[in-house]
């Protein structure tokens, strides 16, 4: 009995559902009563899911697996794995027994996108040419381990004086911290690129340093020039700092965070104490750092609705304020590709290829190209659909007339994360069916 599975690993994002495809060719007169289907972990032989005696025997794997019961009779023995975790990564074997017996193993590669890197500078004040500064690039909650690359404003790689460390959390995801030590010139731009090798996702950030003396006068409140990018569901730090004078005490400080446009109060510190969150109880200051001039705000469990501008007001004797923008983002899933019609395709047939990618933010850009990398712009219709959380599903439809054979690729780009998710379909030979049958 020939059992067919994909040759390439199935890549699944943490928290999403994955389908481990497995198929066999049922003979005429086949009935499910004859079928014994077992999914197990290849290496440990742990039972994952089974179908026997004409019945789905259910999940033996944390209740997160399911078959496709309506498709079994057609030879579709695929397994749905829900809410994928890092620990699910590995090889799964699909055993099919009717009269004969066959098996095949499919690999699951788990991935999680890295957040847009945050950049910090130490020291971050009164910088002069010739000073040595430490630039830290931090990106969070990715899998597997990331590669980090630094370059200057001219695109020249910076490899000396770089220390990169990866830190695993309880979910098996990694935070990456890369430190670059540089001697400042008159001015300079330093870029950090964090690459997820499985998703081929590059997350970039850069910092431009213009050494100069800070002006004196009113309280100078400093915030990042660039928007703070935060993934939906993660925590974000809206950085804000001021320079406390000698003898400064927290009793003198009035700190107010508010929404820039609506003036809605978000969080405050007055009369020597933290007055707490006025924003859905999801904000916090860094109390131990306030006396050193760190007025940053932590925003927990970021939602799409949090996107916008936040103003940090600092009053001691003098007064100063500055606004920082929060840009919310969510990565798009790897696109799924469907073909209509998907059977008996011949050159000259008109076929509709649909590329679908889910639960991203903000709206995606979609690009189509052929096997030679030539953009396909005609006969493309793309639609975005927002869900209750404000995330978007994108569906792009390409209508083409088939040549003798051809590859059609769809690229879904998250413009904020600079994350590209690719899907492609190759249509070869004649006549053919998609997906190819056993």
């Amino acid at each position: 009995l020939e059992v067919q599975v994909p040759e390439d690993p199935v890549v699944a994002l943490v928290g999403t559902d994955a389908t481990l495809c497995c198929s066999f060719s049922p003979e005429p007169g086949f009935s499910l009563a004859q079928l014994n289907l077992i999914w197990q972990l290849t290496d440990t032989k742990q039972l994952v899911h089974s179908f026997a005696e004409g019945q789905d025997q259910g999940s033996a794997y944390a209740n997160r697996t399911a078959l496709f019961p309506d498709l079994l009779a057609q030879g579709n023995a695929s397994l749905r794995l829900q809410r994928v975790r890092v620990a699910d990564e590995g090889s799964f074997t699909c055993f099919v027994s009717i009269r004969d017996f066959g098996s095949a193993a499919v690999s699951l590669q788990v991935a999680a996108p890295y957040s847009k890197p945050s950049m910090t500078l130490e020291p971050n004040k009164d910088l002069r040419p010739g000073d040595t500064v430490t630039i830290t690039c931090s990106s969070y909650q990715g899998y597997p381990e990331a590669e980090v690359f630094w370059q200057d404003g001219q695109g020249v790689p910076l490899t000396g004086n770089v220390t990169t460390s990866q830190m695993a959390n309880e979910q098996g995801l990694f935070d990456v911290h890369s430190i670059l030590r540089v001697v400042l010139g008159a001015n300079g731009t330093y870029s950090c690129l964090v690459r997820n090798p499985v998703l081929q996702q590059d997350a970039h950030s850069s910092v431009t340093i213009t050494p100069q003396r800070s002006p004196t006068g009113a309280v100078e409140v400093q915030v990042p020039e660039d928007p703070v990018v935060a993934l939906v569901g993660t925590d974000a730090t809206l950085r804000c700092s001021f320079s406390p004078e000698p003898g400064f005490s927290l009793a003198q400080l009035n700190l107010i965070w508010q929404l820039t446009d609506t003036k809605q109060l978000v969080h405050s510190f007055t009369e020597g104490r933290d007055q707490g969150s006025a924003y859905a109880n999801r904000t916090a200051l860094f109390p131990d750092l306030l006396a050193q001039g760190n007025a940053s705000l932590r925003l927990q469990r970021v939602r799409v609705a949090d996107e916008g501008s936040f103003t940090c007001f600092v009053s001691i004797r003098d007064f100063g304020s500055a606004a920082v923008s929060l840009q919310v983002a969510a990565p798009y899933s790897k696109p799924s590709m469907t073909l209509e019609p998907n059977k008996d395709l011949r050159p000259g047939d008109t076929v509709t290829i649909t590329c679908s990618s889910y639960r991203g933010y903000p709206e995606a850009e979609v690009f189509w190209q052929d096997g030679q990398g030539v953009p396909l712009t005609g006969n493309v219709t793309t639609s975005q659909m927002a869900n209750e959380q404000g995330l978007f599903d994108v569906h792009s439809v390409l209508r083409v007339v088939l040549g003798a054979n051809g590859t059609y690729s769809c690229l879904v780009r998250n413009p904020v994360l600079q994350q590209d998710a690719h899907g492609s379909v190759t249509i070869t030979g004649q006549p053919m069916t998609f997906p190819p049958e056993a």
Partner: antibody
Framework: EVTLVESGGGLVKPGGSLKLSCAAS????????MSWVRQTPEKRLEWVAS???????FYADNVKGRFTISRENARNILYLQMSSLKSEDTAMYYC??????????????WGQGTSVTVSS | QIVLTQSPANMSASLGERVTMTCAAS???????LHWYQQKPGSSPKLWIY???NLASGVPGRFNGSGSGTSYSLTISSMEAEDAATYYC?????????FGGGTKLEIK
């Protein structure tokens, strides 16, 4: 049964090169992160390099630029190409399988090791 | 990098004696990512305890691991001859992944 068998060690002069191999069997090699760990003559264990299933590699600072880890998933073989060798690279080199997150990335299987001596 | 310091470096114990060895980290390590390996002369290291307190397959129940933060320990409730070996702690919490210097346990 999981087995990891290293080969390729030997005596080499400072500045020389050596290529270690590790033949893996008894598990789905292509899905695991694999590492090289060395044990110095003083019996200290040091992580040297790791390679993800797809081929992305990571190195300890003291071997970066001199050592290259690679893998041939089709043949279940892990390699460590060592060049510009120094006396401090003298050690027993172990091929190690890193387990997944359900064992919190513990190194659950080690080969028997292959000895590398760098001396003039 | 996280430095793991094991103490004592060498120790001996009588059969039936309770044995405790420690592993101190230079900065906090998640208990999930602190592992122990056993190595006997002429053999390669073997995974012995993973995630601070979980015994690897085939490890006798007289072994126990505990700890959190920067302080971890391995305890043998009643020393047996086959326990004579060197034990290494290891962290996979923050790269570079590091090992302790080992505690060599001999029979008195």
């Amino acid at each position: 049964e999981v087995t990891l068998v290293e080969s390729g060690g030997g005596l080499v002069k400072p500045g020389g090169s050596l290529k270690l191999s590790c033949a893996a069997s008894g598990f789905t090699f292509s899905t695991y992160v694999m590492s090289w760990v060395r044990q110095t003559p003083e019996k200290r264990l040091e992580w040297v390099a790791s390679i993800l299933s797809g081929g992305t590699s990571f190195y300890a600072d003291n071997v970066k630029g001199r050592f290259t880890i690679s893998r041939e998933n089709a043949r279940n073989i892990l390699y460590l190409q060592m060049s510009s060798l120094k006396s401090e690279d003298t050690a027993m080199y172990y091929c190690v399988r890193r387990y997944g997150h359900d064992r919190y990335y513990a190194m659950d299987y080690w080969g028997q090791g292959t000895s590398v001596t760098v001396s003039s | 990098q996280i430095v793991l310091t094991q103490s004592p470096a060498n120790m001996s114990a009588s059969l039936g004696e309770r044995v405790t060895m420690t592993c101190a980290a230079s900065s906090s390590v998640s208990s999930s990512y602190l592992h122990w390996y056993q190595q006997k002369p002429g053999s390669s290291p073997k995974l012995w305890i993973y995630s601070t307190s979980n015994l690897a397959s085939g490890v006798p129940g007289r072994f126990n691991g505990s700890g959190s933060g920067t302080s971890y320990s391995l305890t043998i409730s009643s020393m047996e001859a086959e326990d004579a070996a060197t034990y290494y702690c290891h962290q996979y919490h923050r790269s570079p992944w590091t090992f302790g210097g080992g505690t060599k346990l001999e029979i008195k």
